[in-house]
C-alpha cells in the first residue's frame, strides 16, 4: 500500500484561531477526526468535499475538522480567537510569490507582466482555449487568476482580455527573491518553507521524519512557525529539517537584504571592555584565551579548519583574531594558535555586572562571573582552591581554573540549577547561591533536551531476585512518620537516601521523623517481619522551586525481599505520551472505612501542552514538571500521598519519574496530576548522593 504523504506541511497554522463566516452563502463541511494531519490530507486531496478546500480548522476539544472553501483573506469571513481551535490555511492560496515554475501558485494576481487584465478561465472571450477548470481539476483555474497548470517555463500566465494579445506571463516574483535576511538570518521570520535544493521543510512542531530538539513551545522566541526556514542555533544562514527521510536538514536559499540593517531588537548591546550577558555584543580587542594562548585569525584555516568565517557570519565582527561569540556560546571564545587546543573561552574578560554582589545568570550560570560568595542557606562560601580535590571527584574534565577565583559562586560542573559553592560546613558540603536567572532569559537549562529521544531507562534489565522478577514488589515505598503518624510517602533510591517532597516536613527537629520501610499496611500491622524503622539524619532540600527533598537515613536500609531501591531516570529524558504509570500512597482515599493498605492509581503520561488545556489554560507547565492523567475518573494522589512516586516502566525497568507534591487539588475529574519531573533533577540527586557523607552499615 502506497504511504500517503503528510500534507500538513502545506498549511500555515494560526493557533487558537477560527474563521467565522459572515456571508451565509459560504459552505463548510465538518467531520469528527483524531488529528489535524487527517484534516490536512483530506483538504489537500479535496476528497468528499463539495468545494475546493482552501483552509480548515481543527477543533481540539471536540476532535473535529471544519473544512472551508475560503481563507482568512476571503470576503464574508472574519477571524476569531478560540482556545480550542487551530486554523490551517493552504499556503498556496495566501502566498504572493512562486516556487520554481509556479505550478502550485494559487494566489490572486490577475494582471500580466505588461499590465493587461487576465481573461477568466471559464470564458472563451476574447480567446477560445482548452484550459477549462473542469479539465484541470486541482489546478485552481478560478476567476481570472494567473496560473501555470502545466508547469511550463516562464511561470504563471493567463489569456489576456486584450484581443491582440492571446496570453502573457504574469510578473510574480520567486519566493527566494522576495525573502531576504540580515546578517546570518537569526532574526529572519519570513515564509520560506523549502530548502535550496527544493525539498519541502518539516514542520517544527513535528518529529517525523526527523526527531529534533527545536520544539516551538520550548523556544517561544525562535519563531518556529509552521515549517519555515529559521536559524535558531547560530548557523551561517537559515535552514530546516526536510521531509526527505534521507536528508535530515538543509540550508534555505534566502538572499541578504539590500539594506542590510538589523532591527534594534536584534542588536546585542555592544561593549568593548567587558562582557554583557553572554558576550554576543563584545567588540573589544582581547585576542588570547583565558590562559594566554593567542587566538587564530577568523579568516585563517590554520592550524584549525572551521566555517566560522567573516563571510559566513556577517555582522558578528569576526575581525583579526579578537575573541567573539558568533554562535551563542556561553561567552566570547576563539580558535587558538596551538594545534592541540582547538578552541578556548576568553573568560579573563570581566563581566560588566561585576560590581553587583547579587546579580543574575543566563542559561545554567556556567558563565556567571559575579562576586557573590554566600549560599542560599546563609553560609559563606569557602575558597575554591581548598576544594579542588572534591570537585575533581564528581566532574570528569579539567575545570576552567581562571573562573574559580576566591570563593565566588560559580558553576564549574555544568550544574543545571545554577551557580553554587563549597561551604566548609560538613552538614552542607556545598549549596546553591541566591542568584536568579536573568529576566527574559529563555536559554534551556537541560543540555540533554537537545536530544528528546533520550530514553529514561538505563539500558540494564529489570533486577531479578531469586530468579523471579520483582515486578509486583513495591519495596522502595517509604512511609514517612511525623510524631508517630504517617504524613507522607517517599521512594528509597539508595540504601541511605529517600526522595520525597519538602511539604512533608513541618518541623525542623529531625527527632520528630522516622522512615518505615518494607510495609504494606500504614500502621505496620502484619508487617512485623519485614518492617524496618529508621531515623532521619538530614534533609537536603532541592534546587530553588523544586519542592524536592533528599532525606538521609541515620543508617542504611538493608535490602531484602521486602525493601528495595527504585531506579532514577536519565537526566533530561522524555517519556513518551500515553506511557502507563502508577502512583502509590497511604493517603486520603475518600473512604470512611479506609483499611490502611497501600493503594495504587494507574495514570498515563500526558504532554505539557495538553495537560495545560485540561487545566483550562490556568496552569503553564515548565521543564521541571511532568503530567499524568487518570485512567479511572477521580483517581489520583491526595493528602498523605505527597512525597510519593509516579512510577513508570520503560524497557522492562521501573523508575521514579515524578514526585507527588501538593497544590492542584485531589483527583479532580478530567484534571491530570502535575508532578515534579525527576529527570530534570536527576543530576542534582546524583551529585548529592556523591558528595554528602553517609553512615556506613
Amino acid at each position: 500500500q502506497r504511504k500517503r504523504r503528510n500534507t500538513i506541511h502545506e498549511f500555515k497554522k494560526s493557533a487558537k484561531t477560527t474563521l467565522i463566516k459572515i456571508d451565509p452563502a459560504l459552505k463548510i463541511k465538518t467531520k469528527k477526526v483524531n488529528t489535524a494531519d487527517q484534516c490536512a490530507n483530506r483538504c489537500t486531496r479535496n476528497k468528499g468535499l463539495p468545494f475546493t478546500c482552501k483552509a480548515f480548522v481543527f477543533d481540539k476539544a471536540r476532535k473535529q475538522c471544519l473544512w472551508f472553501p475560503f481563507n482568512s483573506m476571503s470576503s464574508g469571513v472574519k477571524k476569531e480567537f478560540g482556545h480550542e481551535f487551530d486554523l490551517y490555511e493552504n499556503k498556496d492560496y495566501i502566498r504572493n510569490c512562486i516556487i520554481g515554475k509556479g505550478r502550485s501558485y494559487k494566489g490572486t494576481v490577475s494582471i500580466t507582466k505588461s499590465g493587461i487584465k487576465c481573461q477568466p478561465w471559464s470564458s472563451m472571450i476574447p480567446h477560445e482555449h482548452s484550459f477549462l477548470p473542469s479539465s484541470y481539476r486541482g489546478k485552481d483555474l478560478q476567476e481570472n487568476y494567473c496560473r501555470n497548470p502545466r508547469g511550463e517555463e516562464g511561470g504563471p500566465w493567463c489569456f489576456t482580455s486584450n484581443p491582440e494579445v492571446r496570453y502573457e506571463v504574469c510578473d510574480i516574483p520567486q519566493c527566494s527573491e522576495v525573502e531576504c535576511m540580515t546578517c546570518n538570518g537569526e532574526s529572519y521570520r519570513g515564509l520560506m518553507d523549502h530548502t535550496e535544493s527544493g525539498k519541502i521543510c518539516q514542520r517544527w512542531d513535528h518529529q517525523t521524519p526527523h526527531r529534533h530538539k527545536f520544539l516551538p513551545e520550548r523556544y517561544p522566541d525562535k519563531g518556529f512557525d509552521d515549517n519555515y526556514c529559521r536559524n535558531p542555533d547560530g548557523q551561517p544562514r537559515p535552514w530546516c529539517y526536510t521531509l526527505d527521510p534521507h536528508t535530515r536538514w538543509e540550508y534555505c536559499a534566502i538572499k541578504t537584504c539590500a539594506d542590510n540593517t538589523m532591527n534594534d531588537t536584534d542588536v546585542p548591546l555592544e561593549t568593548t571592555e567587558c562582557i554583557q550577558g553572554q558576550g554576543e555584543g563584545y567588540r573589544g580587542t582581547v585576542n588570547t584565551i583565558w590562559n594566554g594562548i593567542p587566538c587564530q585569525r577568523w579568516d585563517s584555516q590554520y592550524p584549525h579548519e572551521h566555517d566560522m568565517t567573516p563571510e559566513n557570519f556577517k555582522c558578528k565582527d569576526l575581525r583579526e583574531n579578537y575573541c567573539r561569540n558568533p554562535d551563542g556560546s556561553e561567552s566570547p571564545w576563539c580558535f587558538t594558535t596551538d594545534p592541540n587546543i582547538r578552541v578556548g573561552y576568553c573568560s579573563q574578560i570581566p563581566n560588566c555586572d561585576m560590581s553587583h554582589g547579587q546579580d543574575c545568570y543566563r542559561g545554567n550560570g556556567k558563565n556567571y562571573m559575579g562576586n557573590l560568595s554566600q549560599t542560599r542557606s546563609g553560609l559563606t562560601c569557602s575558597m575554591w582552591d581548598k576544594n579542588m580535590e572534591d570537585l575533581h571527584r564528581h566532574i570528569f574534565w579539567e575545570p576552567d581554573a581562571s573562573k574559580l577565583n576566591e570563593n565566588y559562586c560559580r558553576n564549574p560542573d555544568d550544574d543545571a540549577h545554577g551557580p553554587w559553592c563549597y561551604t566548609g560546613n560538613p552538614l552542607i558540603p556545598w549549596d546553591y547561591c541566591p542568584i536568579s536567572r536573568c529576566e527574559g532569559d529563555t536559554t534551556p537549562t537541560i543540555v540533554n533536551l537537545d536530544h528528546p529521544v533520550i530514553s529514561c531507562a538505563k539500558t540494564k534489565q529489570l533486577r531479578v531476585v531469586n530468579g523471579i522478577p520483582t515486578r509486583t514488589n513495591i519495596g522502595w515505598m517509604v512511609s514517612l512518620r511525623y510524631r508517630n503518624k504517617h504524613i507522607c510517602g517517599g521512594s528509597l533510591i539508595k540504601e541511605s537516601w529517600v526522595l520525597t517532597a519538602r511539604q512533608c516536613f513541618p518541623s525542623r527537629d529531625l527527632k520528630d521523623y522516622e522512615a518505615w520501610l518494607g510495609i504494606h499496611d500504614v500502621h505496620g500491622r502484619g508487617d512485623e517481619k519485614c518492617k524496618q524503622v529508621l531515623n532521619v539524619s538530614q534533609l537536603v532540600y532541592g534546587p530553588e522551586g523544586s519542592d524536592l527533598v533528599l532525606m538521609k537515613l541515620a543508617r542504611p536500609a538493608v535490602l531484602d525481599d521486602f525493601v528495595s531501591t527504585i531506579d532514577l531516570p536519565n537526566y533530561g529524558c522524555t517519556i513518551p505520551e500515553k506511557t502507563s504509570c502508577s502512583v502509590y500512597g497511604w493517603g486520603y482515599t475518600g473512604l470512611i472505612n479506609y483499611d490502611g493498605l497501600l493503594r495504587v492509581a494507574h495514570l498515563y503520561i500526558m504532554g505539557n501542552e495538553k495537560c495545560s488545556q485540561h487545566h483550562r489554560g490556568k496552569v503553564t507547565l515548565n521543564e521541571s514538571e511532568i503530567c499524568a492523567g487518570a485512567e479511572k475518573i477521580g483517581s489520583g494522589p491526595c493528602e498523605g500521598d505527597y512525597g510519593g512516586p509516579l512510577v513508570c516502566e520503560q524497557h522492562k525497568m521501573r523508575m521514579v519519574l515524578g514526585v507527588i507534591v501538593p497544590g492542584r487539588g485531589c483527583a479532580i475529574p478530567n484534571r491530570p496530576g502535575i508532578f515534579v519531573r525527576v529527570a530534570y533533577y536527576a543530576k542534582w540527586i546524583h551529585k548529592i548522593i556523591l558528595t554528602y557523607k553517609v553512615p556506613q552499615s
Epitope: 547579587q358 542560599r376 542557606s377 546563609g378 552538614l427 510524631r483 504524613i487 511539604q503 513541618p506 525542623r508
Partner: antibody, heavy 120, light 112 residues
C-alpha cells in the same frame, strides 16, 4: 501564591474574649504553618504563636500562653485565634501569616490584619 | 528569647542614595541544620509587612535587585543601592531559627 482573608474589626469590653478568623485560599492550607503576629499602634511586631493545620500542632510564645488559643478547621481552610481576659494592652492589629515550610521558614503571605479595640 | 537589635531607628535619605540598615541578634542564628533563618520585611504605611530578603541574602520573588542582604552568625545588614520613593516605610529584621520567633524594633526609612 495564596491569600489570607481576615475577619473584621472587633470592639470588646475588658475581661471579655474575642475570636478572630483567617480564611486561606490559593495554597494547600494543611501544608503550611499559620502564624499570628501582634502589632500595637506605632510599635514593632510580636510573634504570638503558630498552628500546623495538617496535624493541629501548635507552638506559643510564652508571653501569650493562656492569652491566645490557636485552632484550625481544615475543611474550610480557616485558622482562628481566641484572645481571652482582654485588657487595654491587647488593643492592637493582629495579623495571620502563612509560614512557608523548609528550606525557607519565612512569612510570605500576610493577612490585612484585624483591629481589636478593648475599651470600657 | 533572642533579642533583635536594629539600628538606626530612623534613616533619612535622599532619593538615589544608598541606605544601609544593621541588625544584631543576641545569639547566633545558625540553626543546627546549617541554615541561618534571618529575614527582612518592609511595612509601608497602612499595609501589612511584605517579605524582601530571606535567609540572610536571598531576594524574594519580585523584589528589585537594588535590595541585598548579607551577614552571618549574629550580625546582618540590609542594603538598598539606590533608594526610590516606593522604598519608604519601616524595615524589620526577623529570626525564625529559635522559638519564639522575634522581630527587630524596626527602622523607618524616610526622605531627608
Amino acid at each position: 501564591q495564596g491569600q489570607l482573608q481576615q475577619s473584621g474589626p472587633e470592639l470588646v469590653k475588658p475581661g471579655a474574649s474575642v475570636k478572630i478568623s483567617c480564611k486561606a485560599s490559593g495554597y494547600v492550607f494543611s501544608s503550611s504553618w499559620m502564624n499570628w503576629v501582634k502589632q500595637r499602634p506605632g510599635k514593632g511586631l510580636e510573634w504570638i504563636g503558630r498552628i500546623y493545620p495538617g496535624y493541629g500542632d501548635t507552638n506559643y510564645n510564652g508571653k501569650f500562653k493562656g492569652k491566645a488559643t490557636l485552632t484550625a478547621d481544615k475543611s474550610s481552610s480557616t485558622a482562628y485565634m481566641q484572645l481571652s481576659s482582654l485588657t487595654s494592652e491587647d488593643s492592637a492589629v493582629y495579623f495571620c501569616v502563612r509560614e512557608e515550610l523548609g528550606p525557607y521558614w519565612y512569612f510570605d503571605v500576610w493577612g490585612a490584619g484585624t483591629t481589636v479595640t478593648v475599651c470600657s | 528569647d533572642v533579642v533583635m537589635t536594629q539600628t538606626p531607628l530612623s534613616l533619612p535619605v535622599s532619593l538615589g542614595d544608598q541606605a544601609s540598615i544593621s541588625c544584631r541578634s543576641s545569639q547566633s542564628l545558625v540553626h543546627s541544620n546549617g541554615n541561618t533563618y534571618l529575614h527582612w520585611y518592609l511595612q509601608k504605611p497602612g499595609q501589612s509587612p511584605k517579605l524582601l530578603i530571606y535567609k540572610v541574602s536571598n531576594r524574594f520573588s519580585g523584589v528589585p535587585d537594588r535590595f541585598s542582604g548579607s551577614g552571618s552568625g549574629t550580625d546582618f545588614t540590609l542594603k538598598i543601592s539606590r533608594v526610590e520613593a516606593e522604598d519608604l516605610g519601616v524595615y524589620f529584621c526577623s529570626q525564625s531559627t529559635h522559638v519564639p520567633y522575634t522581630f527587630g524594633s524596626g527602622t523607618k526609612l524616610e526622605i531627608k
